[in-house]
Interface confidence: low
């Protein structure tokens, strides 16, 4: 039977709880078209979805936060879905002398948890 | 004009944006009364408040997330207020042989940002 309270699987149904999702964005979407040359389109992995009680808790603080949110909902917010790790991505920049490649370590999420 | 760097003043008014707040909790609130002896009451620093565009952005990913949320609000969630660092706290535990002190590095938030 369905659980209202998560164990390890999402109690809300597949794809509803905190997970990694790919979002397509153009350089124009990001406001980067004047200084980034490529890629013109980025596949950005982002963390989306709900954080029901105990689901993918990041650490002790997140477990406490979930518990206190249940007891003091107007005072303590529920945990939310944020990146737990990132994967590097290389962008080609315009520079005064031409172009350069730069690695961004904190741009694309690789994993998610509830914090 | 557009901000290149994360905003530090809250555009929603004092105390409304992502900040550290102290929440009192008893061991009973946390469900810890059977295995933690002291302190009986904890002052838990937690991250609360909203994350309007560019406010205390954690990193490049958070800046992008805020931007894409503005463009695709149903697809991309707004950044949310989570701990950026923690401060250690020592709890006194019951053990089979008596009591012991244990340090928790991830229980009490020390700083907050929007991720």
């Amino acid at each position: 039977s369905a659980h209202l309270h998560p164990r390890d699987s999402c109690p809300l149904g597949p794809g509803r709880c905190c997970h990694l999702e790919t979002v397509q964005a153009t350089l124009e979407d990001l406001g980067w078209s004047d200084w980034v040359l490529s890629p013109r389109q980025l596949q950005l992995s982002m963390c989306v979805g709900e954080c029901p009680h105990l689901y993918r808790s990041a650490n002790t603080h997140a477990l406490i936060k979930a518990r206190l949110h249940g007891l003091q909902p107007d005072r303590v917010p529920a945990p939310c879905c944020v990146p737990s790790s990132y994967t590097p991505v290389v962008l080609m920049h315009r520079t005064d002398s031409g172009v350069s490649l730069q690695t961004y370590d904190d741009l694309v999420a690789q994993g998610c948890h509830c914090a | 004009s557009a901000h290149l760097h994360p905003r530090d003043s809250c555009p929603l008014g004092p105390g409304r944006c992502c900040h550290l707040e102290t929440v009192q909790a008893t061991l009973e609130d946390l469900g810890w009364s059977d295995w933690v002896l002291s302190p009986r009451q904890l002052q838990l620093s937690m991250c609360v408040g909203e994350c309007p565009h560019l406010y205390r952005s954690a990193n490049t990913h958070a800046l992008i997330k805020a931007r894409l949320h503005g463009l695709q609000p149903d697809r991309v969630p707004a950044p949310c207020c989570v701990p950026s660092s923690y401060t250690p706290v020592v709890l006194m535990h019951r053990t089979d042989s008596g009591v012991s002190l244990q340090t928790y590095d991830d229980l009490v938030a020390q700083g907050c940002h929007c991720a």
Partner: antibody, heavy 119, light 112 residues
Framework: QVQLQESGPGLVKPSQTLSLTCTVS??????????WTWIRQHPGKGLEWIGA???????VYNPSLKSRVTISVDTSKNQFSLKLSSVTAADTAVYYC???????????WGQGTLVTVSS | DIVMTQSPLSLPVTPGEPASISCRSS???????????LDWYLQKPGQSPQLLIY???NRASGVPDRFSGSGSGTDFTLKISRVEAEDVGVYYC?????????FGGGTKVEIK
């Protein structure tokens, strides 16, 4: 203090779709961690949980009604809605909307609206 | 679905006297996190239900301390230490451990 108010037709014909809306005031339906619920009470009887929706659109339904129920949320209007298709006289009830959190499941309720299914 | 059974069906009470309502579930409501997922509600005549007790024994905000909840696993009790006239209505227990949440049949409390 958040307030909830149900609205919709009080009379629905058999086989048609019952549609109700719950308007939330005094708080944002967008607030993470809350879920928004529909419960009904047949005349002179007990309470039956219909289903719930999180602000983002995640839903959980009562299996006994799942094939006929749709709950949706409109964050721009601060409202959530119930649609119950193929109604019969057995769906005549007072319908309540409520707000819940993890440990206090229905801590705020609307005043309820009576829906009668009759031709 | 988890079946919730309440007793008694009707409870005539005298103001100032204690009262007790029992609720039994068809399976344990004790979660591994130590909480019993059992709530109590009161529906006063002509009103919506209101939350009294959550997680078996926690009083909801604004609920007088004459109301208390106890029990664990499958057997739960709601006690009113000294009944007042405003306490009349139908009391429901409800489990929220598993979907769908289910309610007991209700106990009608009335003044003798």
């Amino acid at each position: 203090q958040v307030q909830l108010q149900e609205s919709g037709p009080g009379l629905v014909k058999p086989s048609q779709t019952l549609s109700l809306t719950c308007t939330v005031s005094g708080g944002s339906i967008n607030s993470g961690g809350y879920y928004w619920t529909w419960i009904r009470q047949h005349p002179g009887k007990g309470l039956e949980w219909i289903g719930a929706i999180y602000y983002s659109g995640s839903t959980v339904y009562n299996p006994s009604l799942k094939s006929r129920v749709t709950i949706s949320v409109d964050t721009s209007k601060n409202q959530f809605s119930l649609k119950l298709s193929s109604v019969t006289a057995a769906d005549t009830a007072v319908y309540y909307c409520a707000r819940g959190v993890e440990y206090q499941h229905f801590n705020e309720w609307g005043q309820g609206t009576l829906v009668t299914v009759s031709s | 679905d988890i079946v919730m059974t309440q007793s008694p069906l009707s409870l005539p009470v005298t103001p100032g006297e204690p009262a007790s309502i029992s609720c039994r579930s068809s399976q344990s409501l004790l979660h591994s996190n130590g909480y019993n997922y059992l709530d109590w509600y009161l529906q006063k005549p002509g009103q919506s239900p209101q939350l009294l007790i959550y997680l078996g024994s926690n009083r909801a905000s604004g609920v007088p301390d004459r109301f208390s909840g106890s029990g664990s696993g499958t057997d739960f009790t709601l006690k009113i230490s000294r009944v007042e006239a405003e306490d009349v209505g139908v009391y429901y227990c409800m489990q929220t451990l598993e979907a769908p949440p289910t309610f007991g049949g209700g106990t009608k409390v009335e003044i003798k």
